[in-house]
């Protein structure tokens, strides 16, 4: 059997493989060792017994989408049946005091691989026995602690595979310089040690995306905006736009990034090198926001034209493909960050990203101020309570609701929240009466709201003992 027979249900074309060469990966035309690594079809009854105590689930994730030329990282995590975990030695053990369907286990081990490897790897003391190999026959790498790594992961995409020895969690990074744009499929098959052979325990696949557009996200924040996710904002208050570029492999770290904004309100283009920008709309209406991000990155230089070729025949590509050693680096110029060795040659690649949004601008409450506080004298039955009137003004649209949150002096522990509808005239002057239980210092957050906005003001207030001589004090506003 060949790798593509085992790992995929379709045979990939050599043309596709040639156009998607992944550095360090091998062609899935290579032979698969079925004696060491048995192959089970989906639905084969043997899957049921491939793991003691249930089925192992593999979860495959990636940091897709990836900008072409950047690295994309895939992570595989194994989820064991209930009460099982991997210990420091790579053995699979039962968690202490954990009860599953079979009850508490007397044997601490699900799989004691340490004991197995000591029994089976005595050959010439090197540990390089004929079974410590990957499915294509390549030997396991002998870095420190390799014996504690008991899972074999075979990654497969674009007609190529990558083999990795690991524990219950592995990561693999792939450079996308030679990957065809668009959605691609990554498939992973996981085997576990089983004496002197291996047993398949899980298969998983996931779609990843390679793009030539910088993945751009924009968050928008505006003070007093009631719902930041509805793309409705307030007139006459600045909106803060913050651009997030999805670049987990830091491919654009050495790029010069420019942000070109068009706010759709005839204020022209605004170009900046800062990822945040503030803009105030002064008219109501619907506006089309457009952002273009340009990253000027060092790119690979096309090789200089070769010298005139001798007329003797050279081997065909079909031949060279067969002998392609995936562990040797690709041809010069394949590295996406290779810089020119030719003086003054411009080897810059411009990458672009786009963001577009339609935003609605409406009237809103722009500002709230407490202009006066008055202690209201209480009748005798409530000697411990104080009634205080807050005289409040606002600017912008007319509020329909007022809320007060009374909390401790640090403004962290809420003691009381009261919201009530209000009917305010055009002057936007209202009085809010609130009760304070006992003397002391309080933090008062007062918000005025309507459908689209929520404006806040805060003050610290000192409520005196019920001594008529002691005045009410605003600690600070």
């Amino acid at each position: 059997k060949r790798f593509h027979d085992v790992l995929g249900n379709e045979r990939p074309s050599a043309y596709m493989r040639e156009h998607n060469q992944l550095n360090g990966w091998s062609s899935d035309e290579n032979d698969w060792n079925e004696k060491l690594y048995p192959v089970w079809k989906r639905g084969d009854m043997r899957w049921k017994n491939s793991w003691k105590g249930g089925r192992v689930q593999a979860v495959l994730t990636s940091d897709s989408p990836a900008l072409v030329g950047s690295n994309i990282t895939f992570a595989v995590n194994l989820i064991f049946p209930r009460c099982q975990k991997e210990d420091a030695n790579g053995n699979i053990v039962y968690e202490k005091n954990c009860r599953n369907e079979a009850g508490l286990s007397a044997d601490p081990y699900v799989y004691n691989w340490t004991a197995w490897s000591e029994d089976s790897d005595g050959e010439n003391g090197t540990g390089q026995s004929h079974h410590n190999v990957f499915p294509d026959g390549k030997p396991f790498p002998h870095h420190p602690g390799w014996r504690r790594w008991n899972f074999i992961y075979v990654f497969h995409t674009l007609g190529q595979y990558f083999q990795k020895l690991g524990r219950c969690s592995v990561r693999v990074s792939v450079n996308t310089a030679n990957v065809t744009l668009g959605p691609q499929l990554m498939e992973v098959t996981v085997y576990r040690r089983h004496g002197r052979a291996y047993v398949p325990i899980a298969q998983v696949k996931d779609v990843y995306v390679v793009t030539d557009q910088i993945p751009v996200f924009v968050t928008m924040f505006q003070k007093n905006d009631r719902n930041s996710s509805d793309e409705t904002f307030l007139k006459d208050l600045p909106i803060m736009f913050d651009v997030l570029i999805h670049d987990p492999s830091h491919f654009l770290n050495y790029s010069t990034i420019n942000y070109k904004w068009s706010f759709g309100d005839n204020t022209g283009l605004f170009v900046s090198t800062n990822h945040t920008v503030n803009h105030t709309y002064v008219l109501n209406g619907t506006f089309s926001l457009n952002l273009t991000v340009k990253a000027a990155a060092p790119g690979p230089c096309p090789p200089p034209p070769p010298p005139p070729r001798p007329s003797k025949p050279t081997p065909s590509l079909a031949t060279t493909l067969k002998s392609y050693d995936s562990n040797t680096p690709g041809p010069a110029g394949d590295n996406p960050l290779e810089l020119s060795r030719i003086p003054d040659e411009n080897c810059q690649i411009n990458r672009y990203g786009h963001f577009q949004a339609t935003i609605t601008i409406v009237e809103g409450i722009l500002e709230v101020n407490i202009i006066q506080m008055t202690d209201v004298l209480m009748p005798v039955p409530w000697p411990e309570s104080s009634l205080i009137d807050f005289v409040v003004t606002c600017q912008g649209s007319i509020p329909t609701e007022v809320c007060t949150i009374i909390s401790d002096p640090t403004c962290e522990i809420t003691q009381n929240t009261v919201c009530s509808p209000v009917d305010v005239d055009e002057m936007c002057l209202l009085t809010v009466r609130r009760t304070f239980n006992g003397s002391g210092t309080y933090c008062v957050n007062l918000t005025l709201g309507d459908d689209t906005s929520l404006a806040l003001t805060s003050t610290l207030i000192s409520v005196p003992d019920r001594d008529p001589a002691s005045p009410l004090r605003m600690a600070n506003s």
Epitope: Y15, E18, Y352
Partner: antibody, heavy 125, light 107 residues
Framework: QVQLQQPGAELVKPGASVKLSCKAS????????MHWVKQRPGQGLEWIGE????????NYNEKFKTKATLTVDRSSSTAYMQLSSLTSEDSAVYYC??????????????????WGQGTSVTVSS | DIQMTQSPASLSVSVGETVTITCRAS??????LAWYQQKQGKSPQLLVY???NLADGVPSRFSGSGSGTQYSLKINSLQSEDFGSYYC?????????FGGGTKLEIK
Amino acid sequence: QVQLQQPGAELVKPGASVKLSCKASGYTFTSYWMHWVKQRPGQGLEWIGEINSSNGRTNYNEKFKTKATLTVDRSSSTAYMQLSSLTSEDSAVYYCARLGYYSGSPYPYYAMDCWGQGTSVTVSS
Amino acid sequence: DIQMTQSPASLSVSVGETVTITCRASENIYSNLAWYQQKQGKSPQLLVYAATNLADGVPSRFSGSGSGTQYSLKINSLQSEDFGSYYCQHFWNTPPTFGGGTKLEIK
């Protein structure tokens, strides 16, 4: 929209060389391979070779390995094909074509999805 | 190199008829095949990719089929603008060779 612009005609002398150009617009030039195809009068299409517009990597038809040299200039989004030691056999229309890709399951598929108008090369003394 | 054999080399048909052009590969190309149309004095245009998928803007009277080594392009109810030459091309390996072409002429 995606366009590949080629000059209409070139008249060259036997033994000389000619450099044909193909200017791309309407797409990200470096994201696509560029192909070159030969068509002699009244004949079919013959694949010459292809170049990766991003890194300059090339693949050639064995038949054209000593005849054609493919290059790109990313700054102007232009692909070039130089034909050397020209003879009357090289008189033909030469097309550049973009290699398009289509998502397949599980692998992408390819086809030449956009062609230039072709440059007619006449080799004559 | 994979040889692509197209047949017939030419055919003469009337508007409204249905025609089928075939393309045989010298080895299995697993549906990695494209069809192009070329009108007199013009550059080729992509019709079909991956053996069966119509390219954008191609009328539905065109259809591609086949697998393994045998592929065909069918044109239902031929229109006057369909006359010209048709080529298949494989993308199984390098070089991606073309078929010899089929010339479709008005009867």
